[in-house]
């Protein structure tokens, strides 16, 4: 205490000179703003982590901090700098009463603030079941020793780096950020403290039972012997990592982030930052049988995020809980009795279970596949890992029935052969947040940067929606979804390809009003239609229905309402080839589906007619769904006939440089 | 008691900028579309802006890209930032309220004058 | 954007007559109407939502019918509190919502 009061009593001399008053406030429109864990009892109030706009350098944050420091002690307040952050985010970490929350959004640079909160470590429970003697069996999984051009960093407990299954493989760093030990009579006991740590080195390389054997691993200790550790530590971790990617570049990297807390902006941010670094990051859904979305680093766009399933491909559940699930989840992967290294003797083997094990297949994974192709960008490596996975096998109906279509069914697996996929043309389904239900909300979904929005649908579950359009953001194509009054909310669900050299645009036909319907076609030479989509100003679209099939010699071409504007998304890329295939049901029926054949890629899918008894349309794999209102409120006339229109593309130009290759 | 109180209305010259602001109390602000909706004086009601929870905005023609619509949830606060303004602005500007099973403007401010004159 | 149309300008009627105000719209705004009064000095009320449900605080004199193109408010027994300006409203096709240019009911 004495030393801080020493400290304090320099900066407000050093800084007297400064502006006495309040910071000036920032300019209209951009207040900086204050979060905090919705989670209460994951809430550690008093520590704030001041996150400062993008461009604001080192000596800037410095000053912000004594700036702040100076303001407070003017005050009467104590305040402390627990830490600087650049290299990812600019801001830094303060010990602070919350009275001063208000002044510190007025200094000047301050984006916004973020009160620090906990994060778990994902496995439940720790110590199952001891296998000795240390046998694992052998046949099961022989992979070759895979994983060697690539850095493994565990953000984890500490670990016990001497146990036979991952000695030589791991190298533990100096780093540890870890929060004290709940309860006065906590004893330390090493084995403890190493538990999930070591475990999830183990999944991912250890001799026995790793995934990629071959893989390197680097430890950096955030969680604490009750696998508990901070957002702030995580992000000083973080940043850690990428320091040390900046002194010594080295292949590949994957960060895996066996923890999840409550949502986090600034967690999120620093994912974000960490991963356009070119850093392939995979994190834990979360172990909480909830929307994968409310936990971080779960909900980062930019991590691959992990759910749990069983031997069975059942979700997991543990105990009272279970897997995390949700449009959040990138994946599932094995998370029920996991068989491991036990920190509990440097021979001993454990199950554990949790979404953590299930991060550390898909890290595993990661490395493998990294090692082999390591010039592969996250955007590829996220879809390679969608596009080998086993599709439809885990049984949807453990996940509340509103989230089903939102979740994927992918659980992961190692690529059949690790070259040879780059002749196709891969794509996922990206969904968005749920709209709201006012009038006036929206939703947007987005592809990451190096991937191409090919078509964009809509969906909700009531059916009262206003369609969909491709726009505009920020130099990049989102899709955003409309809802409409008295609606419960929309999805947008945008189609993200990986389409390298190409060059798409949208051409918009407003609303025909007068004829059959409206129609748009690419008519650009050497475009192709990727996707069509229909926006309807109108909150009653009509039940007037356009002609379903398309005039011959017209493929490029979509087709809608008479009262909507009709968006066509026209491709232009070496050897891209598309066709259109639909699938039309006269008799009224809740779920129309056309599917994309072997060598073809589903791009686009959308409904006929566009009327209000359409819930909407969206890929599964690729598959074309379209969903109905139920059957029995639709009645049997010829408004309840609906087409599911589905767009297929391949590229005959990635087919051949992948021939050139072999 | 549903409250809507405007503010930040006043006298400007062409081409000048102005913002306006309504804070509303007695509901919870966060879960409804809010509008702006003018009046110039002895005309009828013009719908200027309007704005979605999360933050999805739309404009009248005639003022997109000119004004800006913005909401602070956490402080109950609606803004209209008008720029470039001209006489054909000249209006009692209200701030209303669409509720998620009523349409139509179910709340209204008591509006604020704005004056464009040279 | 869809024209609204309100007929007469003014209407004129004695207290205890019925007043009948008329609203027109440009294409096809099916039950999305709603009607305002508004009276000196005030901010506009909502009255009438969905073409012909009466908003909270409204006796049942007043009613609104019509769909489509066509819609009339009706006030079945004018009372000295019923003199004001009365606008419609569409909400089907937006942006923008429009607003009628208004009917003026006064005392004869």
């Known amino acids: 205490q004495e030393d801080e009061d020493g400290d304090y009593e320099e900066l407000v001399l050093a800084l007297r000179s400064e502006e006495d008053g309040l910071a000036e406030a920032p300019e209209h429109g951009t207040t900086a703003t204050f979060h905090r864990c919705a989670k209460d009892p994951w809430r550690l109030p008093g520590t704030y982590v001041v996150v400062l706009k993008e461009e604001t350098h080192l000596s800037q944050s410095e000053r912000t901090a004594r700036r702040l420091q100076a303001q407070a002690a003017r005050r009467g307040y104590l305040t402390k700098i627990l830490h600087v952050f650049h290299g990812l985010l600019p801001g830094f970490l303060v010990k602070m009463s919350g009275d001063l929350l208000e002044l510190a959004l007025k200094l000047p640079h301050v984006d916004y603030i973020e009160e620090d909160s906990s994060v778990f470590a994902q496995s439940i429970p720790w110590n199952l079941e001891r296998i000795t003697p240390p046998r694992y069996r052998a046949d099961e999984y022989q992979p070759p020793d895979g994983g060697s051009l690539v850095e493994v960093y565990l953000l984890d407990t500490s670990i016990q780096s001497d146990h036979r299954e991952i000695e030589g493989r791991v190298m533990v760093t100096d780093f540890e950020n870890v929060p004290e030990e709940d309860g006065t009579r906590f004893h330390r006991q090493a084995s403890k403290c190493d538990s999930h740590g070591t475990h999830l080195a183990g999944v991912v390389s250890g001799r026995d039972a790793g995934v990629a054997k071959g893989a390197s691993m680097r430890s950096l200790r955030v969680l604490n012997c009750q696998g508990k550790g901070t957002v702030s530590g995580t992000l000083i971790g973080l940043e850690f990592i990428r320091k040390s990617q900046l002194v010594q570049p080295v292949g590949p990297l994957v960060v895996l982030l066996p923890l999840a807390g409550g949502y986090s902006r600034v967690l999120n941010a620093a994912c974000q930052r960490l991963a356009r670094a070119g850093v392939v990051l995979v994190t834990a859904a979360g172990n909480f049988r909830d929307d994968a979305c409310l936990y971080s680093p779960a909900s980062a766009p930019e991590v691959i995020t992990v759910g749990a399933t069983n031997a069975q491909d059942q979700p997991v559940t543990l105990g009272t809980l279970g897997t995390n699930f949700g449009r959040c989840v990138d994946l599932f992967a094995p998370g029920e009795d996991i068989i491991g290294a036990s920190s509990d003797c440097s021979t001993c083997f454990v199950s554990q279970s949790g979404t953590s094990q299930a991060a550390a297949h898909v890290a595993g994974i990661a490395a493998m596949m990294l090692s082999a192709e390591p010039e592969l960008t996250l955007a590829e490596l996220r879809q390679r890992l969608i596009h080998f996975s086993a599709k439809d096998v885990i049984n949807e109906a453990w996940f509340p029935e509103d989230q089903r279509v939102l979740t994927p069914n992918l659980v992961a697996a190692l690529p059949p052969s690790t070259h040879g996929a780059g002749w196709q043309l891969f794509c996922r389904t990206v969904w968005s947040a749920h709209s709201g239900p006012t009038r006036m909300a929206t939703a947007v979904a987005r592809c990451a940067p190096d991937e191409e929005l090919l078509s964009c649908s809509s969906f909700s579950r009531s059916g009262k929606r206003r369609g969909e359009r491709m726009e505009a953001q920020g130099g990049k194509l989102v899709c955003r979804a409309h809802n409409a009054f008295g609606g419960e909310g929309v999805y947008a669900i945008a189609r993200c390809c990986l389409l390298p050299q190409a060059n798409c645009s949208v051409h918009t036909a407003p609303p025909a009003e007068a004829s059959m319907g409206t129609r748009v076609h690419c008519h650009q030479q050497g475009h192709v239609l990727t996707g069509c989509s229909s926006h309807w100003e109108v909150e009653d679209l009509g039940t007037h229905k356009p002609p379903v099939l398309r005039p011959r010699g017209q493929p490029n071409q979509c087709v809608g309402h008479r009262e909507a504007s009709i968006h066509a998304s026209c491709c232009h890329a070496p050897g891209l080839e598309c066709k259109v295939k639909e699938h039309g049901i006269p008799a009224p029926q809740e779920q129309v589906t056309v599917a994309c054949e072997e060598g073809w890629t589903l791009t686009g899918c959308s409904a006929l007619p566009g009327t209000s008894h359409v819930l909407g349309a969206y890929a599964v794999d690729n598959t074309c769904v379209v969903r109905s209102r139920d059957v029995s409120t639709t009645g049997s006339t010829s408004e309840g006939a609906v087409t599911a229109v589905a767009i297929c593309c391949r590229s005959r130009h990635l087919a051949q440089a992948s021939q050139e290759l072999q | 008691e549903v409250q809507l109180v405007e503010s930040g209305g006043g006298l400007v010259q062409p081409g000048g900028s102005l913002r306006l602001s309504c804070v509303v109390s007695?509901?919870?602000?966060?879960?409804?579309?809010m509008h702006w909706v003018r009046q110039a004086t002895g005309r009828g009601l013009e719908w200027v802006s309007g704005?979605?929870?999360?933050?999805?905005?739309s404009y009248t023609g005639s003022v997109k890209g000119r004004f800006t619509i913005s909401r602070e949830n956490a402080k109950n606060s609606l803004h209209l930032q008008m720029n470039s303004l001209t006489t054909g602005d000249t209006a009692i500007y209200y701030c209303?309220?669409?509720?998620?099973?009523?349409?139509?403007?179910?709340?209204w401010g008591q509006g604020t004058l704005v004056t464009v004159s040279s | 954007e869809i024209v609204m149309t309100q007929s007469p300008a003014t209407l004129s009627v004695s207290p205890g007559e019925r007043g009948t105000l008329s609203c027109r719209a440009s294409?096809?705004?099916?039950?999305?109407l709603a009607w305002y009064q508004q009276k000196p000095g005030q901010a506009p009320r909502l009255l009438i939502y969905?073409?012909?449900t009466r908003a909270t605080g409204f006796p049942a004199r007043f009613s609104g019918s019509g769909s489509g193109t066509e819609f009339t408010l009706t006030i079945s027994s004018l009372q000295s509190e019923d003199f004001a300006v009365y606008y419609c409203?569409?909400?089907?096709?937006?942006?923008?919502?429009?607003f009628g240019p208004g009917t003026k009911v006064d005392i004869k």
């Open positions: 209303a309220r669409e509720d998620i099973a009523v349409p139509g403007f179910d709340y």
């Open positions: 007695g509901f919870t602000f966060g879960d409804y579309d």
């Open positions: 704005i979605a929870p999360a933050g999805d905005t």
């Open positions: 294409q096809s705004v099916s039950s999305n």
């Open positions: 969905g073409a012909s």
């Open positions: 409203q569409q909400y089907n096709k937006w942006p923008p919502f429009t």
